[in-house]
């Protein structure tokens, strides 16, 4: 048992937040400031990511985990771990190779990122358009045209309100 343990890599005992220091006879040393090790048994600590410029700190670096960044207002994250910040557009627009462009008629975008999407086609579900779409909003589909035939009400009227202890007049 002793022989097996002596053959074992002494660095494997170093926990996250430390590194196996070859300069100090392979003892476990804490990661220096602004560095981290997220797993045990590491021979070096990694440098913490710095969130600068357009990048804001979402989570501070610790001895066991890297910093996490997001984007300043007016931009949104792209890529793994927010490696880039893409410019926002206004609602009703999409970002093209030439910049922010208004959504074409029949399409909408209700966010500051992403692409313009076609309005819902209400007739595919046998419904009618209750509220027209805009560049910023999808159409609102209502009941089917058959439900709106003369004499038919599309909305059930509410029951008359009664106060407790009073009979209807």
């Amino acid at each position: 048992f002793e022989r097996t343990r002596s053959l074992q890599d002494p660095c494997s005992n170093c926990p996250a937040g430390t590194f196996c220091d070859n300069n100090r006879n392979q003892i476990c040393s804490p990661c220096p400031p602004n560095s981290f090790s997220s797993a045990g048994g590491q021979r070096t600590c990694d440098i913490c990511r710095q969130c600068k410029g357009v990048f804001r700190t979402r989570k501070e670096c610790s001895s066991t985990s890297n910093a996490e960044c997001d984007c300043t207002p007016g931009f949104h994250c792209l890529g793994a771990g927010c490696s880039m910040c893409e410019q926002d557009c206004k609602q009703g627009q999409e970002l093209t190779k030439k910049g922010c462009k208004d959504c074409c008629f029949g399409t909408f975008n209700d966010q500051k990122r992403g692409i313009c999407r076609p309005w819902t086609n209400c007739s595919l579900d046998g419904k009618s358009v209750l509220v027209n779409g805009t560049k910023e909003r999808d159409v609102v589909c209502g009941p089917s045209p058959a439900d709106l035939s003369p004499g038919a009400s599309s909305v059930t009227p509410p029951a008359p309100a009664r106060e407790p202890g009073h009979s209807p007049q």
Epitope: F75, S83, M84, Q87, K97, G99
Partner: nanobody, 124 residues
Framework: QVQLVESGGGLVQPGGSLRLSCSAS????????MSWVRQAPGKGLEWVSD????????FYEDSVKGRFTISRDNAKNTLYLQMNSLKPEDTAVYYC?????????????????WGQGTQVTVSS
């Protein structure tokens, strides 16, 4: 092909000013964010400033805030760095760099094109 050519560097006394220029060609300049990065003698690359494609959003390294101003002229395909109140620690080679995606600001290790650099020396 993409080309970035810096100019405007030189020797200046502490407290003095310089204006760096970066002339861009070979891509649609007005669609890309641009940066200034510097490398002091014996040191690694240090991000200095970013400007978005339209020029309305600018960002600075803390040590240059209030002293340096990044700007761009999309009609002239040129990026600028106005450097005021220069200090000896601003001595470095200054590079302009292009970001990889349209209307997007990336981290320094993702920049896809760099100029050859211009030397700025601040000394009395």
């Amino acid at each position: 092909q993409v080309q970035l050519v810096e100019s405007g560097g030189g020797l200046v006394q502490p407290g003095g000013s310089l204006r760096l220029s970066c002339s861009a060609s070979g891509f649609t300049f007005s669609s890309y964010a641009m940066s200034w990065v510097r490398q002091a003698p014996g040191k690694g690359l240090e991000w200095v400033s970013d400007i978005n494609s339209g020029g309305e959003s600018t960002f600075y390294e803390d040590s240059v805030k209030g002293r340096f101003t990044i700007s761009r002229d999309n009609a002239k395909n040129t990026l600028y760095l106005q450097m005021n109140s220069l200090k000896p620690e601003d001595t470095a080679v200054y590079y302009c760099a292009k970001h990889p995606l349209t209307f997007t600001i990336a981290t320094m290790n993702d920049y896809d094109y760099w100029g050859q650099g211009t030397q700025v020396t601040v000394s009395s």
